[in-house]
Interface confidence: low
């Protein structure tokens, strides 16, 4: 065993030592006292617990007067059952030569462990959990030893490992669920999980290599709300929040997938919203709609979360106002950048604001369009002026680069090149 394992090996030796009772000739397997174990079809030795090693004893089945093995067997304090089968399971009594009770032993038959089935999952980028289950029935009391280490290799010598790589125990669920959790994991590191199934007849280990990137599966988004848009019988506004389990860090954002369908409709429509809100524009008037959302790491690590619980909404009733021409939809507010303390604030909808469309007659419509045209023109003029100013400043710099601080107010400090604008 490598030196990095010495701490763990000392613990295991201490456990093994504690299991051997000094006052009895019988090693006590962990589990209920007085139970001994064997394998069907194999020879099984039972040990009389209340005597000195080698003392001759008589053996009986509990409740049966027939002597199974006498004190003259030459086997001392042990009873040997050849080719044990289920009929041998049960309670045995051993007595010393003077008739005193040496103890009772219950025999239970079963099998050594097989390698457990292990899988790991992560709901965020800092912690992951592993679950396990027996791959085959052993029929015996079973426990699991769980540990992990970081797969970091130092230099060219692949045998040399940094002491900081473990192994460390993987703390098991205190409520007894077959689960352990690794806290404070590194997103870019590889880990090796060790789950050892132990029963009184042996141990069997499963090693599983995991990386957080591949097992990452966020919890579904929370707080999904679906609201009608007054005056728009084909619109619904859906909004939601990040799952509570997702840590608030600006560098690990989530992207979303939204599905919706009218009641009784078999097929979902799918969209990928850019933020924490989406306006559905092709809802069926008068029908309730189911909506659900799913989340995934924005750089596509891992997999999509399960779907959130469905939320329902019905578009508002009322006359459908005349829509403005499609080009009017270009005149929307610029998207708000995420702030450092907020993973992805609700963005303004990419649809025109409903109030813009709530016109009483075509005169108002024309007035609004004219205003939009003027605003557009002024925007273009302002843009041209800004461009000219920027070019002038650029030429004025000694090295031809922008002056320090220029545009600093519009480039967020936490935005990395190539990161999507969520």
């Amino acid at each position: 065993m490598s030196s990095s394992c010495s701490g763990l090996s000392r613990v295991l030796v201490a456990v093994a030592t504690a299991l051997v009772s000094a006052s009895s000739p019988c090693p006590q397997a962990w589990g209920p006292p007085g139970v001994q174990y064997g394998q069907p079809g194999r020879s099984v030795k039972l040990c009389c617990p209340g005597v000195t090693a080698g003392d001759p004893v008589s053996w009986f089945r509990d409740g049966e007067p027939k002597l199974l093995q006498g004190p003259d067997s030459g086997l001392g304090h042990e009873l040997v059952l050849a080719q044990a089968d289920s009929t041998d399971e049960g309670t045995y009594i051993c007595q010393t030569l003077d008739g005193a009770l040496g103890g009772t032993v219950t025999l239970q038959l079963g099998y050594p462990p097989a390698r457990p089935v292990v899988s790991c999952q992560a709901a965020d980028y800092e912690n992951f959990s592993c679950t396990w289950s027996p791959s085959q029935i052993s029929g015996l009391p079973t426990r699991y030893l769980t540990s992990y280490r970081k797969k970091t290799v130092l230099g060219a010598d692949s045998q040399r490992r940094s002491p900081s790589t473990g192994p460390w125990p993987c703390p098991q669920d205190p409520l007894g669920a077959a689960r352990c959790v690794v806290h404070g994991a590194e997103f870019w590191s590889q880990y090796r999980i060790n789950v050892t199934e132990v029963n009184p007849l042996g141990a069997s280990t499963r090693l599983l290599d995991v990386s957080l990137q591949s097992i990452l599966r966020p919890d579904p988004p929370q707080g999904l709300r679906v609201e009608s848009v007054p005056g728009y019988p084909r619109r619904l506004r859906a909004s939601w929040t990040y799952p509570a389990s997702w840590p608030c860090q600006p560098h690990f954002l989530l992207k979303f997938r939204l599905q919706y369908r009218p009641a009784q409709h078999p097929a979902w429509s799918t969209v990928e919203p850019a933020g924490l809100e989406e306006v559905i524009t092709d809802a069926v008037a008068g029908l309730p709609h189911a909506v659900r959302v799913s989340a995934r790491d924005f750089l596509d690590a891992g997999t999509w979360s399960t779907w959130s619980p469905e939320a329902w909404g019905t578009p508002s009733t009322g006359t459908i106002p005349k829509e403005i021409p499609a080009w009017g939809q270009l005149h929307t507010q610029p998207e708000v950048e995420p702030q450092v303390d907020s993973p992805a604030p609700p963005r303004p909808s990419l649809q025109p604001h409903p109030r813009l469309l709530d016109h009483r007659d075509s005169v108002e419509q024309v007035a609004v369009l004219a205003s939009l045209g003027i605003l557009s023109f002024l925007g273009l003029v302002a843009g041209a002026l800004a461009l000219g100013l920027w070019l002038r400043l650029r030429r004025g710099g000694k090295d031809g680069s922008p002056k320090p601080g220029f545009l600093a107010s519009v480039i967020p400090v936490d935005r990395r090149p190539g990161a999507p604008n969520l």
């Epitope: 289920s86 049960g90 219950t106 099998y111 097989a114 027996p134 029929g139």
Partner: antibody, heavy 122, light 112 residues
Framework: QVQLQQPGAELVKPGASVRLSCKAS????????MHWVKQRPGQGLEWIGM????????NYNEKFKIKATLTVDKSSSTAHMQLSSLTSEDSAVYHC???????????????WGQGTLVTVSA | DVVMTQTPLSLPVSLGDQASISCRSS???????????LHWYLQKPGQSPKLLIY???NRFSGVPDRFSGSGSGTDFTLKISRVEAEDLGVYFC?????????FGAGTKLELK
């Protein structure tokens, strides 16, 4: 001969619990595993778990770990299964079944009880 | 979980015919001890299931010798050499090599 006796039916309200019994006779109760199996019309058979009466050791189907609790009363050679937080999904026939051996291990269901029909209804 | 797939789901026969039911598992049923724990049960209407064959090919006590089981690994077959009226019902295969123990969906043997 081996017999496993179960009550015919139980009617319970949603959210309540029910304790089913299976009285064994005709063999040494403590020597064989006792299994429980759920049967819903059109949904086939589902193994719930098993208990070794001599030691009380249990092995559950993960799906039923929270729903079912298996116990035995050795003095009356009776196995029990408690089902909790009942919903309409739990309406089914529940069979107890005794394991079999032929000198080597293998939990097949050698003898079955007639089954108890559990109906969950308000 | 190990998935047990039975075919056919319905098998119409005439009395005296030979009948054959197939059962396929999603993974090998060979236990680490070398045994294969694949079993067959018959459930007649209004009754609980009854064990016919255990460990692939062993007939349970009292089961007529017209019933036989065969197969290995993941593919198994139950054959009835000459169907009698008392054989009609639903046949289930089951595995107990892996936890949880699982059953096939059943094959209904019925008269044509």
């Amino acid at each position: 001969q081996v017999q496993l006796q179960q009550p015919g039916a139980e009617l319970v309200k949603p959210g309540a619990s029910v304790r089913l019994s299976c009285k064994a006779s005709g063999y040494t109760f403590t020597s064989y595993w006792m299994h429980w199996v759920k049967q819903r019309p059109g949904q086939g058979l589902e193994w719930i778990g098993m208990i070794h009466p001599n030691s009380g050791y249990t092995n559950y189907n993960e799906k039923f770990k929270i729903k079912a609790t298996l116990t035995v009363d050795k003095s009356s050679s009776t196995a029990h299964m408690q089902l909790s937080s009942l919903t309409s999904e739990d309406s089914a026939v529940y069979h107890c079944a005794r394991g079999g051996y032929d000198g080597s291990y293998g939990p097949w269901f050698a003898y079955w009880g007639q089954g108890t029909l559990v109906t969950v209804s308000a | 979980d190990v998935v047990m797939t039975q075919t056919p789901l319905s098998l119409p026969v005439s009395l005296g015919d030979q009948a054959s039911i197939s059962c396929r598992s999603s993974q090998s049923l060979v236990h680490s001890n070398g045994n294969t724990y694949l079993h067959w049960y018959l459930q007649k209407p209004g009754q609980s299931p009854k064990l016919l064959i255990y460990k692939v090919s062993n007939r349970f006590s009292g089961v007529p010798d017209r019933f036989s089981g065969s197969g290995s690994g993941t593919d198994f077959t139950l054959k009835i050499s000459r169907v009698e009226a008392e054989d009609l019902g639903v046949y289930f295969c089951s595995q107990s090599t892996h936890v949880p123990l699982t059953f096939g969906a059943g094959t209904k043997l019925e008269l044509k």
